[in-house]
Interface confidence: low
């Protein structure tokens, strides 16, 4: 299948920053948003400044996701909550995988069966309630150049 433009990070060396992205969730058409106060949710407004994300390849197939405006890193907590922390911890790394439908999934490296996901309401989905095959875990990386 064709890759989304700059869709995967696996080919990039560790530490490589790619162009900022917006992560569009197939479930309800929301963009992953990281607020300056650390909250994480989804929004449909594609010009919202808080959906501009910096994906950095930590190692092959593993990325951190930083909110450019919030200056915070997406993190999966041990209770399944998604929030954004001011500094990088081991909870801030995700396995990025291109699925056969051209969408990416982001699975926690620390809590390996939990995925980044958004509900149809735009709220994040608890990691403990996510799993393979769910629409909520599918994200399309889009250019955020503007």
């Amino acid at each position: 299948p064709a890759l989304p433009e700059d869709g995967g990070s696996g080919a990039f060396p560790p530490g490589h920053f790619k162009d900022p992205k917006r992560l569009y969730c197939k479930n309800g058409g929301f963009f992953l948003r990281i607020h300056p106060d650390g909250r994480v949710d989804g929004v449909r407004e594609k010009s919202d400044p808080h959906i501009k994300l910096q994906l950095q390849a930590e190692e092959r197939g593993v990325v951190s996701i930083k909110g450019v405006c919030a200056n915070r890193y997406l993190a999966m907590k041990e209770d399944g909550r998604l929030l954004a922390s001011k500094c990088v911890t081991d909870e801030c790394f995700f396995f990025e995988r291109l699925e056969s439908n051209n969408y990416n999934t982001y699975r926690s490296r620390k809590y390996t069966s939990w995925y980044v996901a958004l509900k149809r309401t735009g709220q994040y989905k608890l990691g403990s309630k996510t799993g393979p095959g769910q629409k909520a875990i599918l994200f399309l990386p889009m250019s955020a150049k503007s």
């Epitope: 449909r44 594609k46 010009s47 150049k145 503007s146």
Partner: antibody
């Protein structure tokens, strides 16, 4: 019902200016991203410009960049296209189009169009 | 000239199926799942028939379907009817945050 109505088209000389308006009704205009699309006589569709729901983000086709300005007034449920330095190749029917929520480049509601003729 | 390439015309008899192709690049059609298809009858505004490659808006007949492979998207109309005779345009989001259209395909129902 959901409706878009363009106005402001007409005959203008090369180098002249024109301001198109698009009146929206039947939906919450301030929640939607909007676009202008044009179609020259007997030709295909050409995307012209995009504006976000708040008006904070704007994009233009290269062919109109620096000459056209898109804007909106959410209080008046109106979309505008200010066209300056008009050229013969700008002659077309201009449509305003609503963008499908959460999508990119899918226009679900269109106006009936307004004709702009640039000729001396 | 149009960025996306479509055949200038296609034709088919009532009841038949036809497919219209739309070829772009990895910066538009191939790079994103944001391909739309529009139907336009003479003197009328375009009508959205397919979005996100294969989704139909409510009210659009299930005889219309969309797909994509690599840099080429396709619109298939099955059970062709006289009222399907129109111009069809594809469009795609691009990596420069713009939208591009195909040149259009005139469908004739024989």
């Amino acid at each position: 019902q959901v409706q878009l109505q363009e106005s402001g088209g007409g005959l203008v000389q090369p180098g002249g200016s024109l301001r198109l308006s698009c009146a929206a009704s039947g939906f919450t205009f301030s929640s939607y991203e909007m676009n202008w699309v044009r179609q020259a006589p007997g030709k295909g569709l050409e995307w012209v410009s995009y504006i976000s729901s708040s008006g904070s983000t704007i994009y233009y086709a290269d062919s109109v960049k620096g000459r056209f300005t898109i804007s909106r007034d959410n209080a008046k449920n109106s979309l505008y296209l200010q066209m300056n330095s008009l050229r013969a190749e700008d002659t077309a029917v201009y449509y305003c189009a609503r963008e499908l929520t959460g999508d990119w480049g899918a226009f679900d509601i269109w106006g009936q169009g307004t004709m702009v003729t640039v000729s001396s | 000239q149009s960025v996306l390439t479509q055949p200038a015309s296609v034709s088919g008899s009532p009841g038949q199926s036809i497919t219209i192709s739309c070829t772009g690049t990895s910066s538009d059609v191939g790079g994103y799942n944001y391909v739309s298809w529009y139907q336009q009858h003479p003197g009328k505004a375009p009508k959205l028939m397919i979005y996100d490659v294969s989704n139909r808006p409510s009210g659009v007949s299930n005889r219309f379907s969309g797909s994509k492979s690599g840099n080429t998207a396709s619109l298939t109309i099955s059970g062709l009817q006289a009222e399907d005779e129109a111009d069809y345009y594809c469009s795609s989001y691009t990596s420069s945050s713009t939208v591009v259209f195909g040149g259009g395909t005139k469908l004739t129902v024989l």
